[in-house]
Interface confidence: low
Amino acid sequence: EVEKTACPSGKKAREIDESLIFYKKWELEACVDAALLATQMDRVNAIPFTYEQLDVLKHKLDELYPQGYPESVIQHLGYLFLKMSPEDIRKWNVTSLETLKALLEVNKGHEMSPQVATLIDRFVKGRGQLDKDTLDTLTAFYPGYLCSLSPEELSSVPPSSIWAVRPQDLDTCDPRQLDVLYPKARLAFQNMNGSEYFVKIQSFLGGAPTEDLKALSQQNVSMDLATFMKLRTDAVLPLTVAEVQKLLGPHVEGLKAEERHRPVRDWILRQRQDDLDTLGLGLQGGIPNGYLVLDLSMQEALS
């Protein structure tokens, strides 16, 4: 803690300005009124204070607002935000999206810090759900944000917010997360025509069930292999050779390069070799002619 000392004569700060960068730490503590600092926080960011000086300014605000800073101060913290601990941030009540944006801007280009994670958590919990504008903002700053949420947290995302999601925002999502997001996306995009619908739903298809994939196969969508490889294995397995051929269109040739990888490998094992041969790709590993195909899932259910 900075030692309490009287402010030298003539050094009392009348406003927050450049002259303060020449103050020693103890002079800042003694000569800058916390209330003045709070009302002129927007000026702090434009002044090249040292990290040590910022520590003093933070200390003054902490003394003035022991229960947590008001939003009027938080919005103008600027680089002082980087001095905040998650414990400090947990005391805040941030409701304005503009405040959130201002603080995310400070951390822009860096990995999500514990401070930012806490800030986002406080903000989202305060709003009660991840609305479209919030999601738009968060994914713009952190493309991986959506995939950092648990399936339970994702369940609070309203379908209308799905419009804000870009393909790269889903890159790191696992199947459990896509299972939650896919039905929301399906609902959000339900009024679009076939080709437009596929463009929008494509990124979410890792959560699609078999029946939806079958429906897509009837719509000339020409799914690319990158999307196909992200589909749920259990959703792909029941598809027939004809359905996969229709689903992939001209991209069906890509199956050959992926024949050793899931879900293609597992799908091949479930198809009759005769049917696979009709693709003319040289796919091997199907069920030989004359063999009886048992529905193993039914067998397990009965046993």
Partner: antibody, heavy 116, light 107 residues
């Protein structure tokens, strides 16, 4: 500061192999998708391959499929491109880049020349 | 594959000029487009993503617009350091594809 440094380029004959490396520093390598992009002499940029953060998913351009293999060693913060059956048309400067669809950081590149 | 076509392939301009480069996709790519600046012997630099969002640290004289198949990169007032080659790239689907480049030279 994010840094990507490619190495392993050189002059080889058609049909030979080469392995390129990309050493990454200044960021958590294991969290990011990585790409290889090339630029032939007097030509534009051409995407070659992509690998996801844990190395379980890879994608290739048709022109290199079956000949090139992208891989990574997250413990050593290094990206690789194994190039087999090289052809004259593979002559280019090869860049590694960080990002998903958008490549926000690039290395300076390493020159691969395939000539007899 | 999605083809990306840029125009013009080269253009001459003076410092202070407003310059526009266009990029056309062979099919609808929504807003999944990014622009790069490339200087000789330097690594490409990402300028704009999602068709119109400015990358951190990129001057505001650069702007992007468009969606679907037609996109534009605009430099509102050319600076000496802006003379370079500019590439568009789609990231809607693999394989990722670039435009052939637009070389911006001093008049």
């Amino acid at each position: 500061e994010v840094q990507l440094v490619e190495s392993g380029g050189g002059l080889v004959q058609p049909g030979e192999s080469l392995r390129l490396s990309c050493a990454a520093t200044g960021f958590t390598f294991s969290s990011y998708w990585m790409h290889w992009v090339r630029q032939g002499p007097g030509k534009g940029l051409v995407w070659v391959s992509r690998i996801n953060s844990d190395g379980t998913s890879t994608v290739y351009a048709d022109s290199v499929k079956g000949r090139f293999t992208i891989s990574r060693d997250n413990a050593k913060n290094t990206l690789f491109l194994q190039m087999n059956s090289l052809r004259a048309e593979d002559t280019a400067v090869y860049y590694c880049a960080r990002g998903r669809g958008i490549m926000t950081y690039w290395g300076q590149g390493t020159l691969v020349t395939v000539s007899s | 594959d999605i083809q990306m076509t840029q125009s013009p392939s080269s253009l001459s301009a003076s410092v202070g000029d407003r310059v526009t480069i266009t990029c056309r996709a062979s099919q609808d790519i929504g807003s999944w487009l990014t622009w790069y600046q490339r200087k000789p012997e330097k690594a490409p630099k990402s300028l704009i993503y999602a068709a119109s969002s400015l990358q951190s640290g990129v001057p505001s004289r650069f702007s992007g617009s468009g969606s679907g198949t037609d996109f534009t990169l605009t430099i509102s007032s050319l600076q000496p350091e802006d003379f370079a080659t500019y590439y568009c790239q789609q990231y809607k689907s693999y394989p990722l594809t670039f435009g052939q480049g637009a070389k911006l030279e001093i008049k």
